[in-house]
């Protein structure tokens, strides 16, 4: 079955039971999850706004899935495997009378369960198990799961311990194939593509399925992470990366020292504080610095800004923009241009998109 | 590729029954929920029925329960629909689409048959 | 149950027009709808699942908003291929469609 192909996972409760007061259910929520955390690498964190991963509903009867509640008694709550939309979601049945304790329905005991669900679990057979189908109270103080629940969840998560490559939520590996994945940079080195986002890299080997993920700061330890732009003069060896005002220069794979450097030593005025893309282009050999909703263009041979710069990247690159989030130059006539989970084909010869494809398009995904 | 292929419409009088059946390739059939819909000449789509990736749970629309009977075989890759007591109102293309996979269905059909038409007249 | 109600039933409009559709639920569905295209003699085809995600493969002109009972799909310039019957989805329950025909 399905699983979360990442680490970190955030929650929102989408809406409140009146038997409890809110903090009542925040606790009751988050300690479920607590426990779930417990035995495995995963991290979970409350949203308030926005899309999370896995949504907390209080609902009676019809309620926009397909499995109707019943009333009070029957069915408690469902929750959905992993995965987008309304993957993960958790839903309580409002007509149950939801408390701390152990009259009516137990909030706690119950999220545990459907958490179970809402990470991959199935129903468990050992009556002992918190992912046995039936609901029985138990005392929450002294609540532990199951051998066979750690072995269940353990199984698909690995154990705490891996926490240790990760050790803060910021430190969390993105879902490679999430529909919403954006990159902050991307460019190829040599016959790889590099993409970059937050603390990682993906590295895709041209025309192998195989992709692998890895820390910026175990291949280049003295870089920071969110690099947020990048580019290659491959005739050179030599690799651009920015972050902020500065920038890195790394030449066959190994960092230069003496880096970093302003990014105003390209020539751009003191009102540029940081860029958005940048894509070397060989035919022509010009560097496009992508900044805000204009670019320059930059001439690598005289080390010197074009004149006329900047222009309006809506302007000169039909369909794309006004803004870009990271961009990369192939097979001698075409931009890959990201914008968010798209990403746009653009061939330069033709000025004209000629594909729109996700973001994560490269991986198989 | 993900493919569903749709097959045994056709021509039945009022009264008459039809099974039709749906050949699944490309994925791993037997974790997702799969589902019949249908779509009456030049009306909307209507949704039948729907059953889970090992078939232990089904659900039907209230204007087929009784008479359609929705199963899978998993060692086929295959899902059916065995249509009772047809109707002349029954008369569509009826095509299968694919769900998501877990315990309980999304109603996210992101892979649709091609459809295949049955037609209910004396 | 739940019912869903889309809107227009029919529109018209030009290539490079800017569109958009109405599906409105009859009491709370949270983000759990989903909008699909259909062309004649066709299958339908997924464009958005859970309110706003663009299924892959899908252009990015097509945008969806909305969650609760309140739900808009947006075509931000019309396209030629655009131009088909789309369809509001949640659970077993289907909108009565929009037909988008060439003005």
């Known amino acids: 079955g399905p699983v979360w192909r990442k680490h970190y996972i955030t929650y929102r409760i989408n809406n409140y039971t009146p038997d409890m007061n809110r903090e009542d259910v925040d606790y009751a929520i988050r300690k479920a999850f607590q426990v779930w955390s417990n035995v495995t690498p995963l991290k979970f964190s409350k949203i308030n706004t926005g899309m999370a991963d896995i949504l907390v509903v209080f609902a009676r009867g019809a309620h926009g899935d397909f499995h109707a509640f019943d009333g009070k008694g029957g069915i408690l709550a469902h929750a959905f495997g992993p995965g987008s939309g309304i993957g993960g979601d958790a839903h309580f049945d409002e007509d149950e009378f939801w408390t701390t304790h152990s009259g009516g329905t137990n909030l706690f005991l119950t999220a545990v369960h459907e958490i179970g669900h809402s990470l991959g679990l199935g129903h468990s057979s050992d009556p002992k198990a918190v992912m046995f189908p039936t609901y029985k109270y138990v005392d929450i103080n002294t609540f532990r799961l199951s051998a066979d629940d750690i072995r269940g969840i353990q199984s698909l998560y690995g154990d705490p311990k891996e926490n240790q490559r990760l050790p803060n939520p910021d430190n969390s590996e993105p879902a490679l194939c999430d529909p919403n994945l954006s990159f902050d940079a991307v460019t190829t080195v040599g016959n790889k593509i590099f993409f970059f986002k937050d603390r990682f890299f993906w590295l895709k080997v041209s025309e192998r399925p195989k992709t692998s993920v890895n820390l910026i700061s175990s291949l280049w330890p003295t870089l920071p992470s969110g690099i947020e732009a990048a580019y290659e003069i491959e005739a050179r060896n030599q690799v651009f990366l920015f972050k902020d005002d500065k920038y890195w220069l790394i030449s066959n794979l190994r960092p230069e020292p003496n880096y970093p450097k302003s990014i105003h030593s390209f020539g751009f005025p003191n009102f540029v504080k940081k860029i958005d893309a940048a894509v070397f282009n060989p035919r022509f050999y010009r560097t496009y610095f992508f900044v805000d909703n204009q670019y320059w263009r930059y001439d690598e041979r005289r080390q010197m800004m074009d004149p006329g710069y900047p222009k309006l990247i809506t302007k000169n690159f039909q369909g794309i923009g006004p803004k870009i989030d990271a961009v990369f130059y192939s097979k001698n006539k075409y931009y890959y241009f990201f914008q968010g989970s798209n990403q746009f084909e653009y061939d330069f010869l033709l000025q004209r998109i000629t594909k729109t494809l996700k973001s994560n398009s490269w991986f198989g995904c | 590729e993900v493919q569903l292929l749709e097959s045994g419409g056709g021509l039945v009088q009022p009264g008459g029954s039809l099974r039709l059946s749906c050949a699944a390739s490309g994925f791993t059939f037997s974790d997702y929920w799969t589902h019949w819909v249908r779509q009456a000449p030049g009306k909307g789509l209507e949704w039948v029925s729907g059953?889970?990736?090992?078939?232990?749970?089904?659900m039907y629309a209230d204007s087929v329960k009784g008479r359609f009977t929705i199963s899978r075989d998993n060692s086929k890759n295959t899902l059916y629909l065995q249509m009772n007591s047809l109707r002349a109102e029954d008369t569509a293309v009826y095509y299968c689409a694919r769900d998501i996979v877990g315990p309980y269905s999304a109603g996210l059909f992101d892979y649709w048959g091609r459809g295949t038409l049955v037609t209910v007249s004396s | 149950d739940i019912q869903m109600t889309q809107s227009p039933s029919s529109l018209s409009a030009s290539v490079g027009d800017r569109v958009t559709i109405t599906c409105r639920a009859s009491q709370s569905i949270y983000t759990y709808l989903n909008w699909y295209q259909q062309k004649p003699g066709k299958a339908p085809k997924l464009l958005i699942y859970?309110?706003?995600s663009l299924q892959s493969g899908v252009p990015s002109r097509f945008s969806g908003s909305g969650s609760g009972t309140d739900f808009t799909l947006t075509i931000s310039s019309l396209q030629p291929e655009d131009f088909a019957t789309y369809y509001c989805q949640q659970a077993g329950i289907f909108g009565q469609g929009t037909k988008l025909e060439i003005k």
């Open positions: 059953i889970s990736g090992s078939g232990g749970m089904t």
């Open positions: 859970a309110a706003s």
